[in-house]
């Protein structure tokens, strides 16, 4: 069986297709080269003798068990190897050379004993190597990590190293990788040496599942005395063993640490006092904390020093109670409990993200809600009934608004968005708003992002709502119920450069109402009913237009439509995907393509 | 089309068919064996996926005795600091892991439950699997 | 088995050029692809042209694109490789190889080319 071509002479997906050999038949410049779950077994010298551009090389599952010297050799483009699942025995010394361009080398699970004797010295390119699931129990770092100066992941996750002692780091005290990421989850540890982590820095260092009791945690994070590290994090898997107890000592050690962000990933414990729990975190600059369940949120309003707070997919007693000074950005996405918002006090903050909690909003929004003037960006999509009742006092920075998929009540009643001059984006796509409200985006002078799919308007017309944005490059109007539009909507968007009406209401096509849209590249018209022109004489689009998409819609096919059909024609070289352009009526013509059809009509004298 | 037995219990029968063309092995246990008036229990599966499980959601398809109810989405791997260990897992690579769950004082009535499950991964995103399983439901009296 | 034999190689100035042949004996039906590698002193073994049997496809590397030529001679069972417009950073050891159907490869002796004024 053929390897399936997914990008002619550079893509090959040759998974299972039960090879016992490299294909031979592909041509010479395949960059890409799928070759997972096939019983290859074994890789002789020169195995890719005729892949001489091959840039990713997936070998997941094909039952190597011999790798011999020089078997990847002249592969010098290469930046992936993928070795997943291979039941490796005999690995050659010289198994990896030729790989001068290696920049990703994946070994998971491939029976690997220990890193020392894993032949990868040499490949100076390298920046993240994955031997996560395998069989390592020391956490040496050989000495030939010096060479690796441009390592940025190590995944040893899923190993069985128990214990890590002070000469384990010794290579990254002679050439500190200000840049690695240190994966050790599911590890079972313990014990580390104090001193083992002493002036040494690291970007990320994430411990998950890797203590069977509190008092490993307690001794392991003492261990860690003297780390600089970026981004610190801790926690546990669900499906994984939990700890049976947790309090504020499991977390001491962290005072003795340098950490710029940390963030607690899954705990299967109820935190009651947080306050002195992160003690030691006070004064980190994001502090983040995933799928766990909080009990008492009035400790938000503690001093903290953090400029990011990352609340997901977290349960909560209600809406957490928050003040603090500092807080630039709060990110409180997909969490449980407390589905009425109650207002905060952030007096910093630039970004907020409060999507996909299931909020309801009584009263949106003003300064008060959020206790700022700073804010710039505000994502409250996905959430419940939000009342707009106020025209965003106090938030006139605001620059990206998105409501989507959320209930806006009360938006058509007067001009909502009417202080928000610098505003950028506004999606309000989904949020059963019906326009009956010509000032409805009476304001927005500088937008230039709007979407607003998913709604309805006054008896399904398209009145003058744009006037006022003459910046607008991106306007989605599909799925509006849409059935006829007026002649001047689009008049003031000369910098418009998308417009998508797709799946409306359309019977008819109209050039006239695009006249003004001399910016215009993408016109979509898909999924309406267009049977014919409007008038009988079409103009032409804005000579910008590039792509016009009028697939699934109802074609009339007959003779009294023939100059529009000889229209459609004319538009060819704009239309998107014409094979899905198809008659609806007559019926004999239901289904033909439209472009193939050739209507030669008689005038009747 | 092969249908596969994961278990019985006091008011349920439960197997499973594939619902897709590839029918790539997956093991299935239950125990105990689920009970819908309540449960509580150990998922176990064994499973070598063929694309990377980062970002996997089910599509989930249920039909009670002929009435379709609307298609659910369960996201249960967002893509990074995931809550499951297996999210982490490579196309190729043994995913062996035991899921703990439990329910109870749900009212099920009699009859034929159905779910297809749609397991979506990776960028882009691709179909992993597809199994449509079978609970037949028989309350006991008491 | 594919013996290999190469010959052609020798001392040229800049700007000169200079024609490789490789001859081929044995099992020769057994030959897939065929092609002409090279080490300088001290680098990795690099592909410099290739071309398979079958279809006559070629492939050069980026360094010597437009300046060599790869071909063949099927009656006298030989593979060419015409370099052109030689510079003193083409000098190195070439080398011809074959791979068979059975994915093994097989290796010429070498010959050694020297650009130099």
């Known amino acids: 069986e053929p390897c399936v071509e997914v990008v002619p002479n550079i893509t090959y997906q040759c998974m299972e297709l039960n090879f016992y050999k490299i294909p031979d038949n592909l041509p010479f410049s395949t960059k890409n080269l799928d070759l997972s779950f096939n019983p290859l077994r074994h890789l002789g010298s020169y195995s890719f003798f005729s892949f001489p551009e091959l840039q990713v090389l997936d070998l997941s599952r094909c039952e190597i068990q011999t790798i011999e010297d020089g078997a990847y050799q002249s592969l010098s483009h290469l930046s992936t190897l993928i070795l997943t699942g291979n039941p490796i025995q005999s690995l050659a010394l010289g198994a990896f050379s030729g790989l001068s361009s290696l920049q990703k080398l994946v070994a998971v699970e491939t029976n690997l004993a220990s890193l020392e004797n894993f032949p990868i010295g040499h490949l100076k390119t390298l920046k993240e190597l994955n031997v996560a699931h395998n069989l390592i129990q020391s956490f040496k770092l050989p000495e030939y990590f010096s060479n690796l100066t441009n390592l940025e992941h190590l995944d040893l996750s899923s190993n069985k190293i128990q214990s890590i002692y002070c000469t384990d780091l010794r290579v990254l005290h002679q050439m500190p990788l200000l840049n690695l990421s240190l994966d050790l989850s599911l590890n079972p540890m313990n014990f580390i040496q104090p001193g083992a982590f002493k002036e040494i820095r690291l970007h990320k260092l994430t411990l998950r599942n890797n203590f069977d009791s509190l008092n490993v945690m307690k001794t392991c994070i003492q261990g860690l005395a003297g780390l600089e590290v970026h981004r610190l994090v801790l926690g546990e898997f669900r499906n994984e063993g939990n700890l049976e107890k947790f309090d504020k000592s499991a977390l001491e050690g962290l005072c003795n640490l340098t950490i710029e962000e940390f963030r607690l990933a899954y705990l299967d414990y109820y935190l009651d006092d947080i306050i002195d729990l992160f003690n030691c975190l006070t004064n980190v600059s994001s502090f983040s904390l995933v799928s766990v369940t909080i009990e008492r949120v009035k400790d938000f309003s503690y001093n903290f020093g953090w400029q990011h707070l990352e609340l997901v997919n977290c349960k909560f007693g209600q809406f957490p109670t928050l003040k603090l000074k500092s807080l630039k950005r709060l990110t409180f996405t997909s969490n449980k409990g407390g589905n009425a918002f109650s207002e905060v006090d952030l007096p910093s903050l630039e970004f907020l993200d409060l999507s996909r909690n299931g909020l309801s909003f009584k009263g949106c929004c003003s300064q008060s809600d959020f206790g700022t003037t700073s804010l710039k960006y505000l994502d409250l999509s996905f959430n419940g009934v939000i009342t707009m009742s106020s025209n965003f006092l106090g938030l006139e920075q605001l620059e990206h608004l998105d409501f989507q998929h959320s209930n806006l009540k009360q938006m058509s009643e007067f001009s909502v968005f009417l202080s928000l001059r610098n505003l950028i984006y506004l999606d309000i796509s989904h949020t059963h708003t019906r326009v009956a409200f010509n000032g409805i985006f009476n304001g927005l002078s500088s937008l230039e992002v709007l979407k607003m799919a998913g709604n309805s308007f006054q008896e399904n017309f398209l009145p003058d709502i744009f006037t006022e944005l003459r910046n607008l490059t991106f306007l989605d109007l599909s799925q509006c119920q849409l059935e006829q539009l007026s002649p001047t909507a689009f008049n003031s968007l000369s910098s418009l450069q998308v417009l998508n009406m797709s799946h409306n209401n359309f019977f008819s096509l109209d050039t006239f109402p695009y006249k003004c849209l001399n910016s215009l590249q993408v016109l979509d018209y898909s999924l309406n009913h267009i049977m014919t022109s409007k008038k009988q004489e079409l103009q032409h689009f804005p000579s910008s237009l590039a792509f016009l998409n009028l697939t699934q819609n109802d074609f009339a096919c007959t003779c009294e439509h023939q100059s529009f059909l000889q229209w459609i024609k004319d538009q060819r070289q704009l239309l998107v995907e014409v094979e899905r352009m198809e008659c609806a009526t007559p019926s004999d013509k239901q289904g033909m393509p439209v472009l193939s059809l050739n209507i030669t009509c008689q005038m009747n004298k | 089309q092969k249908q596969y037995w994961v278990c019985n219990s006091s008011d349920a029968s439960i197997s499973y068919t594939y619902c897709d063309k590839m029918q790539y092995p997956i093991s299935i246990n239950v125990n105990p064996c689920i009970e819908l008036k309540r449960s509580k229990g150990l998922l176990h599966i064994f499973y070598i996926p063929r694309r990377d499980l980062k970002q996997l959601y089910f599509n989930l398809y249920i039909t009670v005795n002929t009435m379709n109810l609307p298609k659910r989405k369960e996201v249960i791997c967002r893509g990074s600091d995931d809550d499951y260990s297996f999210c982490r897992a490579l196309k190729g690579e043994t995913v062996n892991t035991t899921i703990s769950f439990s329910f109870k004082g749900i009212k099920f009535s009699k009859g034929k439950y159905k779910c297809v499950v749609e397991a979506i991964s990776g960028s882009p995103e691709e179909m992993l699997f597809c199994l449509e399983f079978v609970i037949l439901h028989q309350p006991n009296s008491n | 088995e594919v013996q290999l034999v190469e010959s052609g190689g020798g001392l040229v100035q800049p700007g000169g050029s200079l024609r490789l042949s490789c001859a081929a004996s044995g099992s020769i039906f057994s030959i897939n692809d065929m092609g002409w590698f090279r080490q300088a002193p001290g680098k990795e073994r690099e592909h410099v042209a290739l071309?398979?049997?079958?279809?006559?496809?070629?492939y050069y590397a980026d360094s010597v694109k437009g300046r060599f030529t790869i071909s063949r001679d099927n009656a006298k069972n030989t593979v060419y490789l015409q370099m052109n417009s030689l510079k003193p950073e083409d000098t190195a050891v070439y080398y011809c190889?074959?791979?068979?159907?059975?994915?093994?490869?097989?290796w010429g002796q070498g010959t050694q080319v020297t650009v130099s004024s």
């Open positions: 071309i398979r049997f079958k279809d006559g496809s070629i």
């Open positions: 190889a074959a791979k068979t159907g059975t994915s093994f490869v097989c």
